[in-house]
Structure formats: structure tokens, C-alpha cells
Interface confidence: low
């Protein structure tokens, strides 16, 4: 006579902010109305109440009014539970209980997860380094959950596992910000990677860092720029570094300094004769002429554009000559999604619609991402087009035609490749029929 | 565009049955709930219950509970209404009106049956 | 059940003068969710019902914007800017927060 409820064997994973469905599902026997289910869900552990239907009725959540029943899908016999913006608090066992006139539970686990974000990498000593230097090298990678695991390898991808210290710190929101210290002693040069990972959903965060003691100079000017481009925002300024090594008794009077653009050999700024010959490049560059006579060449770009992106040389002649190439990567933010729907009413499962999901002036060009309120890729019957207006600068506008649930949540990310800066926008869409009482 | 189109009227004496028809076009009949409302001679507008077109299960308010029945034939998207063992307090426009399945309101209606019972 | 009481009863009004009827429920209208569901109907004559307000406040597709509700808990009202001779008629407060749903009496606006 007990009444067979069903859940899944595996634990729901559910992202922080997203919603959750715990499925629980029960085989109404001939003869059954709503009038005679009693559902209770509830905390397995505290046996705190979540939520009810009784009486025919919904009697709500119980749970901070963040979770909701499928009114329409009840009579059929599905018990799921839908969980709102779901938190690190939230995770755990959850008991579904049926009782029609025999009586039935069963438990479904939920686990929570959040993403890290892309680490960032710092340096301690930063410059000045030499061979044989011993170095502190910080990973840094926030708001995720469950705690992360961290991995350290070098260029040649061979991990790193001795001098590391991983400290991991929880907020006030449940969610953790990794910090991880290795201490490695310097070669003549060397890639270093962080690799976060979070173990539920088998995402990994990865950044590196390249370090390049300074040799001594041999007879050539040794003339050094940062190996990865340069990244400026449209509209700020950008300094693209280059230094080289004074020898004894260097005066500015000996210094040739040349910045042109290396594809074109176009003029950018110049200084000879021991004056700064000012900029050949829209009166928008500048050095640092205090800085020169120790060896600091860099040019400031002022108000980015982006057709500034691309190579410049920096050319430096004192006695003896020498050049190096540094690339300017131009990005620009793009705007949070905007979100549209055709039709936009009376919309009713099975219904097909458009959802046009539009982001405004960044660049680079963006990588579009779709997914449906469980973070599962949507990739059919995207089509995505990209317009460059006359700054250049990317509208994007990604449309999906999706066939619709009873109800959904779609959810549009443009990604900058370069920022790795992700906006993203959502739609939830409700088409259920009608059931008693109002849940909607 | 939405219709319900319901049956003609119906002249019944005491006692007998009537059976009234909504017929809906527009939508998926069974994506929406159908509501009844009864509106008697000179009189406002009383809700009788629905029907859940989804899986065929009725409501009914508590003066509407025996002798009234909500069915369906989404075959043809059409729900009934059928009252048994008609009195002359049963003489009345019978009208069926959707769901609008948000906001838990009635968006569209039938033009109304008018049930009169005599003898 | 909850009783929906309407008044006026009976509402005379001059074209392009405004009207307000008053709707009162024998308990709050505020569901558990937080919404209120309550809503105005109007059936002109030999006419079925037709909506016009659903949750306290907003217009239904095509109703004119001289029709407006307000209210919360157990008082509403719904208000006519500048009645025309097209808005005669008998007007319903409805709520479908409590089952059974129920109306009020009704309000029958007329012009003079």
C-alpha cells in the first residue's frame, strides 16, 4: 500500500542566482484530484517546512517565498519543486512527501555551485628581476562555490607543486575567493599557469604569467617591451612600455628614439637630437621625457581608438641600435543585454518564439553564448550578426528561436574575448495553464 | 484571434438535463483553463469553478458541487457544461470564459447560453 | 468565501465628467506570493463581461487609458477620467486570490 515518489539518484546542481527544479513525481491512481494530495516539502536534515499543498490548495512557500510548485503538472502526478535564485545556503537534502491515501517520501540532494572567475596573476618583486631571483606569484579567483582546486604548471605544462599555499575564504553569501602563493625560483625565463578549478562543474579558470629576467647588455641596445599586447579601453589612455639599459655616462643628447607603426613604418613620435620632436600621430602620443635618461622609453597613447590596434617598434639608438615590437589590443565593454521577444504576449507552450538578445558597442567582436535556466547550451537556431559602426566599435544581436516549455528561462552572455568580460541578460518566459490557487 | 462560441439556448422543464458547449479557436485549447459563470435574471456574476483543459480535472465552487459537470473534448477544443436535474433557480446566462493563464483573471468570453427552465 | 462589496449601487454621470466606484473585500486581497489579484470587469448591455483591470492597476490590451484602478489589501477603486457614452454599463470587482473566485454586485454607471 505506500505510495511509490520518485527522485533522482544524482544531486541537482544548480548555479548561485539561477533556479532549480528538484524533480519529485508520484502515480495518481484512478479517481485522484488535487483535493485529495497532500504534498509537503521539506529540509531532510531540520525537517524544516518548505513548502505545502493541501486542501486542494497550494498553501506557498514557506522558504523565504523563493519556491513554487507546478500547479498545472500536479494533477498528472509531478511534485517538483521549483527553488528560486538559489544560494550556497540552500544546498542539502530535500524530502518530498505524498500522501493521497497511502503515503510516500523520498530525498533529492541539491548542490550548489558558482563559477570562478578568470584569475588574476600578480608578481612580487615585479621589476628588476634577474636569474637565480626568487619570486612570489599570486592566483587570485573569486565568488565561486564549492571550494576550488588549484594547479600550478609551467610553460612546458609540467605541474608545480612544491612552495604552494592555497588559502580559500568564504563572504557573507557562502561564496569563496581563492587565493593561491607559489614561490619558484627565477630560470632565464619562464611561463608560470594557474589553473582554478571547481570540481562540480568541472570548469577550469586559467591565467599565466611570463617572466623575462633582464640579461646584460652585449653590444646591441637591448630594448625591451611586455611580450603580451597591451589591453586599453576605447577613450583611455594607453601606455606602451619600452625601456632599454643606459650604459655609463649615457646623456640624452645621444639618444635616438623612434616609435613608428611597425606594419607601415608610419611616424608615431620621435626624439633626436636631445628634444622630443613631438607627436607625428594625430597630436595623441606622448613619452615620458623625465623618465628617458633612465632608460624609460614608453609612449602614451591618449584616447584609444580602435583603429589604433596593431604593432608598433620602438626604435632606440644610443652608440649601438636596437628595436622591439609591442602590440596595442584595443577592447571596448559591451553593454548588458538587451532582451526582446516575438510575440511578446499571450504566449502558450509549444508556442515558437524569437528572442533577440542585443548588446552595443564593444569590441572586439563578441562570442555569443545561449543557455536555458539549467546552464545548458542552446545552440540550434541561434543567429548571431555583428556591425561595426564608424568608431568601429561592434552592436551585436543574437537571435534564438526556441519552442517554449511551460515555462523557461533563457539567458543570453556576449562575451569580450579580450576583457573576458561577460554581460549577459535573461528572459524568463511563463506559459502555464491555469490551476488554483495563483502561484504566478 | 480568440473565440469561444457557445451553444444556442436551451428551454427545459424541471427536472431534465442540458448539456452547454464552448467551443474555443485561436489557441491551444489545452494550454488554458476554462472558468464558468453563471449569471442569473437581473443579477451579478457568480464564478461556478473551472476545468484544468491540460489534463481534464474540474473545480467547482461549493453551490456548484452534484448536479454540474465541467467536461472536455480537446479533439475538438470544446468544453461542456452539464447540468442535471434542472430547477427554475438553474434559469440563467451560463457563460465560459478563458484563462488568461498569468494573472488570474477571465481575458475571453463565450457570448452566453441561456438556460431557462419552466414548466 | 470572500464577499466583494461594490458601491454606488447605481452611478449617473455627465459625458467627460469622471467617476470613481469603490470595491471592499471581506479579507486582504495580498496573496501568499505578495501579488494582489484583484480585477475590474465590465459587461455593457445585452453584452458578455469584458476585462478591463487586472491586479488592482493594470489596463487590459485595448482598454483606454482613461480607466485606472488603485488600491491595496481590502480597498480599491476604479476611476473614469472623463466618462463617454460608450463606458455605460455594469461594472464588477473580481478577486482570484481566495477560491472560490468572486464578484461584487456591480455598479451600474449610466449618463445622465
Known amino acids: 500500500g505506500a505510495l511509490e515518489v520518485q527522485v533522482p539518484e544524482d544531486p541537482v546542481v544548480a548555479l548561485v542566482g539561477t533556479d532549480a527544479t528538484l524533480c519529485c513525481s508520484f502515480s495518481p491512481e484512478p479517481g485522484f484530484s488535487l483535493a485529495q494530495l497532500n504534498l509537503i516539502w521539506q529540509l531532510t536534515d531540520t525537517k524544516q517546512l518548505v513548502h505545502s499543498f493541501a486542501e486542494g490548495q497550494d498553501q506557498g512557500s514557506a522558504y523565504a517565498n523563493r519556491t513554487a510548485l507546478f500547479p498545472d503538472l500536479l494533477a498528472q502526478g509531478n511534485a517538483s519543486l521549483r527553488l528560486q535564485r538559489v544560494r550556497v545556503a540552500d544546498e542539502g537534502s530535500f524530502t518530498c512527501f505524498v500522501s493521497i491515501r497511502d503515503f510516500g517520501s523520498a530525498a533529492v540532494s541539491l548542490q550548489v555551485a558558482a563559477p570562478y572567475s578568470k584569475p588574476s596573476m600578480t608578481l612580487e618583486p615585479n621589476k628588476d628581476l634577474r636569474p637565480g631571483d626568487t619570486v612570489t606569484i599570486t592566483c587570485s579567483s573569486y565568488q565561486g562555490y564549492p571550494e576550488a582546486e588549484v594547479f600550478w604548471q609551467d610553460g612546458q605544462g609540467v605541474p608545480l607543486t612544491g612552495n604552494v599555499t592555497t588559502s580559500q575564504m568564504a563572504n557573507e553569501q557562502g561564496l569563496f575567493d581563492v587565493h593561491s602563493i607559489l614561490r619558484v625560483v627565477l630560470g632565464a625565463n619562464g611561463t608560470y599557469s594557474c589553473l582554478v578549478r571547481n570540481p562540480v562543474l568541472q570548469q577550469d579558470a586559467h591565467s599565466s604569467v611570463t617572466i623575462t629576467p633582464q640579461r646584460s647588455p652585449t653590444g646591441a641596445v637591448e630594448v625591451q617591451v611586455p611580450e603580451d599586447p597591451v589591453v586599453a579601453l576605447v577613450g583611455t589612455d594607453a601606455t606602451l612600455r619600452c625601456s632599454f639599459s643606459p650604459e655609463p655616462g649615457f646623456s640624452l643628447a645621444q639618444l635616438n628614439l623612434i616609435w613608428q607603426l611597425t606594419d607601415t613604418k608610419q611616424l608615431v613620435h620621435s626624439f633626436t637630437e636631445g628634444r622630443d620632436q613631438g607627436s607625428a600621430y594625430a597630436n595623441r602620443t606622448a613619452l615620458f621625457p623625465d623618465l628617458l635618461a633612465q632608460g624609460n622609453a614608453s609612449l602614451r597613447l591618449q584616447r584609444v581608438r580602435v583603429a589604433d590596434e596593431g604593432s608598433f617598434t620602438c626604435f632606440v639608438s644610443i652608440r649601438d641600435f636596437g628595436s622591439a615590437a609591442v602590440s596595442l589590443q584595443v577592447a571596448a565593454p559591451y553593454s548588458k543585454p538587451s532582451m526582446t521577444l516575438e510575440p511578446n504576449k499571450d504566449l502558450r507552450p509549444g508556442d515558437t518564439v524569437t528572442i533577440t538578445c542585443s548588446s552595443y558597442r564593444g569590441y572586439p567582436e563578441a562570442e555569443v553564448f545561449w543557455q536555458d535556466g539549467q546552464g545548458v547550451p542552446l545552440t540550434g537556431n541561434v543567429t548571431t550578426s555583428q556591425m561595426a559602426n564608424e568608431q568601429g566599435l561592434f552592436d551585436v544581436h543574437s537571435v534564438l528561436r526556441v519552442v517554449l516549455g511551460a515555462n523557461g528561462t533563457y539567458s543570453c552572455l556576449v562575451r569580450n574575448p579580450v576583457l573576458q568580460q561577460d554581460a549577459h541578460g535573461s528572459v524568463t518566459i511563463t506559459g502555464q495553464p491555469m490551476t488554483f490557487p495563483p502561484e504566478a | 484571434q480568440v473565440q469561444l462560441v457557445q451553444s444556442g439556448s436551451e428551454l427545459k422543464k424541471p427536472g431534465a438535463s442540458v448539456k452547454v458547449s464552448c467551443k474555443a479557436s485561436?489557441?491551444?485549447?489545452?494550454?488554458?483553463?476554462l472558468n464558468w459563470v453563471r449569471q442569473a435574471p437581473g443579477q451579478g456574476l457568480e464564478w461556478m469553478g473551472w476545468i484544468n483543459t491540460a489534463g481534464g480535472q474540474p473545480t467547482y465552487a461549493e453551490d456548484f458541487k452534484g448536479r454540474f459537470v465541467f467536461s472536455l473534448d480537446t479533439s475538438v477544443s470544446t468544453a461542456y457544461l452539464q447540468i442535471s436535474s434542472l430547477k427554475a433557480e438553474d434559469t440563467a446566462v451560463y457563460y465560459c470564459?478563458?484563462?488568461?493563464?498569468?494573472?488570474?483573471?477571465?481575458?475571453?468570453w463565450g457570448q452566453g447560453t441561456t438556460v431557462t427552465v419552466s414548466s | 468565501d470572500i464577499v466583494m462589496t461594490q458601491s454606488p449601487l447605481s452611478l449617473p454621470v455627465t459625458p467627460g465628467e469622471p467617476a470613481s466606484i469603490s470595491c471592499r473585500s471581506s479579507q486582504s486581497l495580498v496573496h501568499s506570493n505578495a501579488k494582489t489579484y484583484l480585477h475590474w470587469y465590465l459587461q455593457k448591455p445585452g453584452q458578455s463581461p469584458q476585462l478591463l483591470i487586472y491586479k488592482v492597476s493594470n489596463r487590459f490590451s485595448g482598454v483606454p487609458d482613461r480607466f485606472s484602478g488603485s488600491g491595496s489589501g481590502t480597498d480599491f477603486t476604479l476611476k473614469i477620467s472623463r466618462v463617454e457614452a460608450e463606458d455605460v454599463g455594469v461594472y464588477y470587482c473580481?478577486?482570484?486570490?481566495?477560491?472560490?473566485?468572486?464578484f461584487g454586485g456591480g455598479t451600474k454607471l449610466e449618463i445622465k
Open positions: 470564459a478563458r484563462d488568461d493563464g498569468y494573472y488570474y483573471t477571465m481575458d475571453y
Open positions: 473580481s478577486q482570484s486570490t481566495h477560491v472560490p473566485w468572486t
Open positions: 485561436g489557441y491551444t485549447f489545452t494550454n488554458l483553463g
